[in-house]
């Protein structure tokens, strides 16, 4: 992209290059042939995060507790507030405007990745040799009991939802 008539951090108005306002400040008046651009800081509840020529600052995001949100990082004059979800909840969308409870992994499935404030639980089917008999947002698939190591034999085979059942070996008389 070839360079434009005005340099970086400048804007063109009425055939003149004026300085943009720095992040955290809004435009009050454009420059003239004899005066510089006039900028003013955003108020406490507002921000602007780029070099700009905005005449109004943006309001900080409100983290609504009724939607399960809480403040993760307080906004400044240059940054917006970052919201996250309360414990046990995660963001419904990338913009995190509301939260929903983490899903549990049903029996036969284990937790592959525990949910965070911004991502839901990721479940995976228990592979052969593993099981989960609970509905849980935390529990991974557990390995079947090894009967051999207990000097026992398998009496009932395990499934993806149940452990094996071990029993004593039949003694030869």
């Amino acid at each position: 992209e070839p360079p434009t008539a005005c340099r970086e951090k400048q804007y063109l108005i009425n055939s003149q290059c004026c300085s943009l306002c720095q992040p955290g400040q809004k435009l009050v008046s454009d420059c003239t042939e004899f005066t510089e651009t006039e900028c003013l800081p955003c108020s406490e509840s507002e921000f602007l995060d780029t070099w700009n020529r905005e005449t109004r600052c943006h309001q900080h995001k409100y983290c609504d507790p009724n939607l399960g949100l809480r403040v993760q990082q307080k906004g400044t004059s240059e940054t917006d507030t970052i919201c996250t979800c309360e414990e046990g909840l995660h963001c419904m969308s990338e913009s995190c405007e509301s939260c929903v409870p983490h899903r549990s992994c049903l029996p036969g499935f284990g937790v592959k990745q525990i949910a965070t404030g911004v991502s839901d639980t990721i479940c995976e089917p228990c592979p052969v040799g593993f099981f989960s008999n609970v509905s849980s947002a935390f529990e991974k698939c557990r390995p079947w009991t090894s009967c051999e190591t207990k000097d026992l034999v398998v009496q009932q085979a395990g499934t993806n939802k149940t452990d094996v059942v071990c029993g004593p070996q039949d003694r030869q008389r």
Partner: antibody, heavy 116, light 107 residues
Framework: QVRLQQSGAELVRPGTSMRVSCKAS????????INWVKQRPGQGLEWIGI????????NYNENFKDKATLTADKSSNTAYMQLSSLTSEDSAVYFC?????????WGQGTLVTVSA | DIQMTQTTSSLSASLGDRVTISCRAS??????LNWYQQKPDGTVKLLIY???GLHSGVPSRFNGSGSGTDYSLTISNLEQEDIATYFC?????????FGGGTKLEIK
């Protein structure tokens, strides 16, 4: 005083290119932007583009992006507009104009006639 | 692009009259409306910049006003040397655009 002296009238053939010059005096050449404007009889004024003589940076009207090229020579305080692939539609008076405030100082205009 | 409209293409007035020429933009142009005078010999001069700023050397009988989308140029006490075509132009956003012009003639 501020003065923009443009090159003289030209008769050019269709399909060729030509260059209009605009020599600035009476002010710091690199401190002000230069605009170019086209005027055809009965068609009003059309802004072609704007040039920063200090940096060489430009902005063009989309309608002239493939038609006009704006440049400057700081050593001679001269701005140039190259017009390419000329057709009868390009027959017009072309003005160079120093910016700030607005289109503050105009050259006398250069009449370009495209004819076989 | 912003369209600039001068509804009156020609205007007749007598010397000494007060004349008003109007210009409308298709959207808000803040204050960035400029007025130009083109004499019959083709020379062009800036009269008013940014709605109401009188350019250096321009007589005080020229006055600009307006806001938003509606602007006007008033010439009080019309003189013979004011016979010309007057153009408005917006300098708010690219591409810069002009009105079609208003030709002022003497009755």
């Amino acid at each position: 005083q501020v003065r923009l002296q443009q090159s003289g009238a030209e008769l050019v053939r269709p399909g060729t290119s030509m260059r209009v010059s605009c020599k600035a005096s009476g002010y710091a050449f690199t401190n002000y932007l230069i605009n170019w404007v086209k005027q055809r009889p009965g068609q009003g004024l059309e802004w072609i583009g704007i040039l920063n003589p200090g940096s060489g940076g430009t902005n063009y009207n989309e309608n002239f992006k493939d038609k006009a090229t704006l440049t400057a020579d700081k050593s001679s305080n001269t701005a140039y507009m190259q017009l390419s692939s000329l057709t009868s539609e390009d027959s017009a008076v072309y003005f160079c104009i120093r910016g700030s405030p607005g289109f503050a100082y105009w050259g006398q205009g250069t009449l370009v006639t495209v004819s076989a | 692009d912003i369209q600039m409209t001068q509804t009156t293409s020609s205007l007749s007035a007598s010397l000494g009259d007060r004349v008003t020429i109007s210009c409308r933009a298709s959207q808000d142009i803040n204050i960035y409306l400029n007025w130009y005078q083109q004499k019959p010999d083709g020379t062009v001069k800036l009269l008013i910049y940014s709605t109401s700023g009188l350019h250096s050397g321009v007589p005080s009988r020229f006055n600009g006003s307006g806001s938003g989308t509606d602007y006007s140029l008033t010439i009080s006490n019309l003189e013979q040397e004011d016979i010309a075509t007057y153009f408005c132009q917006q300098g708010y956003t690219l591409p810069y655009t002009f009105g079609g012009g208003t030709k002022l003639e003497i009755k």
